[in-house]
């Protein structure tokens, strides 16, 4: 059941990214580190880079509430079991600052792409009986 909930959370993050993509014009047009083509075993490290990025509402009024709520939900911390898996490869993964910086639209697209990759890997690892997902 925990595995199922984990998948639901990951898919939910994709939906949150999709919702934020509707409001790119209401986001601060700041360039943010946006991992792409993330090497194997560095997915969780890249994920944390996306979570740490200072994505912000431009406070233009109309959509400010849903944007702020969505951004905060994107930063929901995964459980320590995944943190432990990240830890194993942390020293060999690129730092957040080393990734190319992109405006919010591309940042969100790359975040979605990473989430899709992580979901695919998670499903593959379950199919092949691997624990390290």
């Amino acid at each position: 059941q925990g595995q199922d909930r984990h998948m639901i959370r990951m898919r939910q993050l994709i939906d949150i990214v999709d919702q934020l993509k509707n409001y790119v014009n209401d986001l601060v047009p700041e360039f943010l580190p946006a991992p792409e083509d993330v090497e194997t075993n560095c997915e969780w490290s890249a994920f944390s880079c996306f979570q740490k990025a200072q994505l912000k509402s431009a406070n233009t009024g109309n959509n400010e509430r849903i944007i702020n709520v969505s951004i905060k939900k994107l930063k929901r911390k995964p459980p320590s079991t995944n943190a432990g898996r990240r830890q194993k490869h942390r020293l060999t993964c690129p730092s957040c600052d080393s990734y190319e910086k992109k405006p919010p639209k591309e940042f969100l697209e790359r975040f979605k792409s990473l989430l899709q990759k992580m979901i695919h890997q998670h499903l593959s690892s379950r199919t092949h009986g691997s624990e390290d997902s």
Partner: antibody, heavy 126, light 106 residues
Framework: QVQLVESGGGVVQPGRSLRLSCAAS????????MHWVRQAPGKGLEWVAF????????YYADSVKGRFTISRDNSKNTLYLQMNSLRAEDTAVYYC???????????????????WGQGTTVTVSS | EIVLTQSPGTLSLSPGERATLSCRAS???????LAWYQQKPGQAPRLLIY???SRASGIPDRFSGSGSGTDFTLTISRLEPEDFAVYYC???????FGQGTKVEIK
């Protein structure tokens, strides 16, 4: 069982204050965001305010901003709504509702208000 | 801010008939962010559907939700006497409600 019980409603004059309470039981209160929603007589539902599970963020409808304050005491499993400068148009049944998206990664994941109280009536009249 | 417009305002049907309720958003809504509620007279609302199409706990399978983008639908396949009520759609995150659709007995 999971339950929310509102109290504190009543008849109050315009310009006066009132504090509503919502007692939660049957679930880990500190893991859920909480809402206040109201319904004027014969009207539809109007969202009023939301507070994050840990109280770190609060959001308000424009109609109550600057007059109403949402707060919570996780040690008492209680949600509050402090209503100041009350107006006739604040007359309504006030419901507290649990946000269905738990702060726990493996917890509930509903993007909706999944548990509601029975409501408490606030009448603002001179 | 997003506006949710529900139609029709009132739906007059007989038990056993199919009810189709519409909710139109003024801007695109991610399907995860769309919920439906049922409210009977003198009662608190009840969550029926979350994520546009997922039934909440304990909701019978005659209730179904669908749609994406700006157009969403709640369908009650065969109306039971207890289904006559007011139905509201809501966008999560802004927590805006539609004005409601009343399903009444014809």
């Amino acid at each position: 069982q999971v339950q929310l019980v509102e109290s504190g409603g009543g008849v109050v004059q315009p310009g006066r204050s009132l504090r509503l309470s919502c007692a939660a039981s049957g679930f880990t209160f500190s893991s859920y965001g909480m809402h206040w929603v109201r319904q004027a007589p014969g009207k539809g539902l109007e969202w009023v305010a939301f507070i994050w599970y840990d109280g770190s963020d609060k959001y308000y409808a424009d109609s109550v901003k600057g007059r109403f304050t949402i707060s919570r005491d996780n040690s008492k499993n209680t949600l509050y709504l402090q209503m100041n400068s009350l107006r006739a148009e604040d007359t309504a049944v006030y419901y507290c509702a649990r946000d269905g998206d738990s702060s726990d990664w493996y917890g509930d994941y509903y993007f909706g208000m999944d548990v509601w109280g029975q409501g408490t009536t606030v009448t603002v009249s001179s | 801010e997003i506006v949710l417009t529900q139609s029709p305002g009132t739906l007059s049907l007989s038990p056993g008939e199919r009810a189709t309720l519409s909710c139109r958003a003024s801007q695109s809504v991610s399907s995860s962010y769309l919920a439906w509620y049922q409210q009977k007279p003198g009662q608190a609302p009840r969550l029926l559907i979350y994520g546009a199409s997922s039934r909440a706990s304990g909701i019978p399978d005659r209730f179904s939700g669908s749609g994406s983008g700006t157009d969403f639908t709640l369908t009650i396949s065969r109306l039971e006497p207890e289904d006559f009520a007011v139905y509201y759609c809501q966008q999560y995150g802004s927590w805006t409600f539609g004005q409601g659709t009343k399903v009444e007995i014809k």
